[in-house]
């Protein structure tokens, strides 16, 4: 009972932190850069993400455009893109291997085959989460070097948007789901056929002491 | 009009001293990142050292870490260079340069001093 | 310490021809390259940062671009007054460093 409630318990963290991961990667809020004008007094925040960048007026008026030309882009934002991508479809196929292993569903029903797929489902998980995790500490590493770096221009150094927080927390959520998920395992893998054999060999001196008894119970 | 004006520059034997410095006039000097560059007489480019807006945090190359100390006086908005134990190599014009809100690297240069290292 | 190799170290153009000078990087620099022009006599001018971004004044017929390590400043129509000395310098990581220089001359 224990058991499946960690497992429902690492299924419903892997999927906020796929959400997460989602809300991450579609907001334009990696790097936020705040820009107040030294002659005029202008005040407007740019939002730059992986998809689209936009600029917010002090007055609240929100523009945004979305970025071009793929070729166009630099490399690390299109490593990040893909990681992205890859990291959310990771997930998705770490809930499929779950549902097909689940305690509660009957696609599979040899109980050490379900208790593999979790397993799996639980490792496929924290790949999805270190997937999700390369993308965000690179850009923020990208940040503080620039912020600490005296040539790089105030207007052009930027700020860690909320996008890389709820990357981390989409990152450590799926970290922790897939975690649990492989520690309610103990009947699954490598430990299933040991739990088995033990089962048969404190049976089995009783069976074969039984015989040898026999004659000697026989002979008296 | 943004202007910087360096001097102390001139002549000076190997393991002398010589202090540079940089007047600064046209912009409000505690604001901007300030750094010297140097430039032989092969007239290869060299980053000498820079120093932050409020002085706090000063960055050298190995080439002259130890040897050579940044500062400033943001009351007065001048740029100091103190230079000891040059050597022969050290012979360059020294450029006092400002940084820039929007543009990064080194976006206004000074005129220049040149130094000397000989015996 | 990350080196730039620029090349050509000089170069002779004619008026309204187009040039390309260009810098290598020993290294990943991303695009932290800065292009600066030094005419006769004077000091070095920021003409280009952020590896394509131009300063503000600097004629449209300079463009500056990345591919990778190597970097690339392209006069569209060369003019007499882009006689000058052109370096390249990155401002990646500490320390910073210039290329050797291309002189540019009008044929």
């Known amino acids: 009972m224990a058991s499946a409630g960690m497992q429902i318990l690492g299924v419903v963290l892997t999927l906020l932190g796929w959400v997460n991961g989602l809300v991450s990667c579609a907001l334009p809020m990696w790097k936020v850069t705040a820009f107040i004008g030294n002659s005029i007094v202008v005040a407007q925040v740019v939002w730059e993400g992986l998809w689209m960048s936009c600029v917010v007026q002090s007055t609240g008026q929100m523009q945004c455009k979305v970025y071009d030309s793929l070729l166009a882009l630099p490399q690390d934002l299109q490593a990040a893109r893909a990681l992205c991508v890859i990291a959310l479809l990771v997930a998705l196929f770490g809930l499929l291997v779950y549902l097909a292993g689940a305690k509660c569903t009957t696609c599979v029903e040899e109980k050490d085959s379900k208790a593999r797929l979790v397993l799996t489902s639980g490792i496929v998980f924290v790949i999805s989460g270190v997937l999700t995790l390369i993308p965000v500490c690179w850009t923020a590493h990208a940040i503080i070097r620039d912020f600490y770096n005296p040539l790089v221009a105030e207007a052009q150094k930027r700020e860690l948007g909320a996008s890389l927080y709820l990357g981390w927390a989409a990152s450590g959520l799926l970290l922790l789901g897939g975690g649990l998920l492989c520690c309610t395992c103990p009947s699954g893998g490598s430990q299933g056929p040991s739990h088995y054999m033990a089962r048969y060999s404190t049976s089995a001196p009783a069976i074969s002491r039984g015989p040898s008894e026999y004659p000697t119970k026989n002979y008296v | 009009e943004v202007k910087l004006v360096e001097s102390g520059g001139g002549l000076v034997k190997p393991g002398g001293s010589l202090r540079l410095s940089c007047a600064a006039s046209?912009?409000?000097?505690?604001?901007?990142?300030m750094s010297w560059v140097r430039q032989t007489p092969a007239k290869r480019l060299e980053w000498v050292v820079t120093?932050?807006?409020?002085?706090?945090?000063?960055y050298y190359p190995d080439s002259v870490k130890g040897r050579f100390t940044i500062s400033r006086d943001n009351a007065k908005n001048t740029l100091y260079l103190q230079m000891s134990s040059l050597r022969a190599e050290d012979t360059a014009v020294y450029y006092c340069?400002?940084?820039?809100?929007?543009?990064?690297?080194?976006?206004?240069w000074g005129q220049g001093t040149l130094v000397t290292v000989s015996s | 310490d990350i080196q730039m190799t620029q090349s050509p170290s000089s170069l002779s153009a004619s008026v309204g021809d187009r040039v390309t000078i260009t810098c290598r990087a020993s290294?990943?620099?991303?695009?932290?390259l800065a292009w600066y022009q030094q005419k006769p006599g004077k000091s070095p001018q920021l003409l280009v940062y952020?590896?394509?971004l131009l300063v503000d004044g600097v004629p449209s017929r300079f463009s500056g671009s990345r591919s990778g390590t190597q970097f690339s400043l392209t006069i569209s129509s060369l003019q007499p007054e882009d006689v000058a000395r052109y370096y390249c310098?990155?401002?990646?990581?500490?320390?910073?460093?210039f290329g050797s220089g291309t002189k540019l001359e009008i044929k």
């Open positions: 340069i400002r940084g820039d809100y929007r543009y990064d690297g080194f976006a206004y």
């Open positions: 046209g912009f409000t000097f505690n604001s901007y990142t």
């Open positions: 120093i932050s807006s409020g002085g706090g945090r000063t």
């Open positions: 290294e990943n620099i991303d695009s932290y």
């Open positions: 952020a590896s394509t």
């Open positions: 310098q990155h401002y990646y990581s500490i320390p910073y460093t």
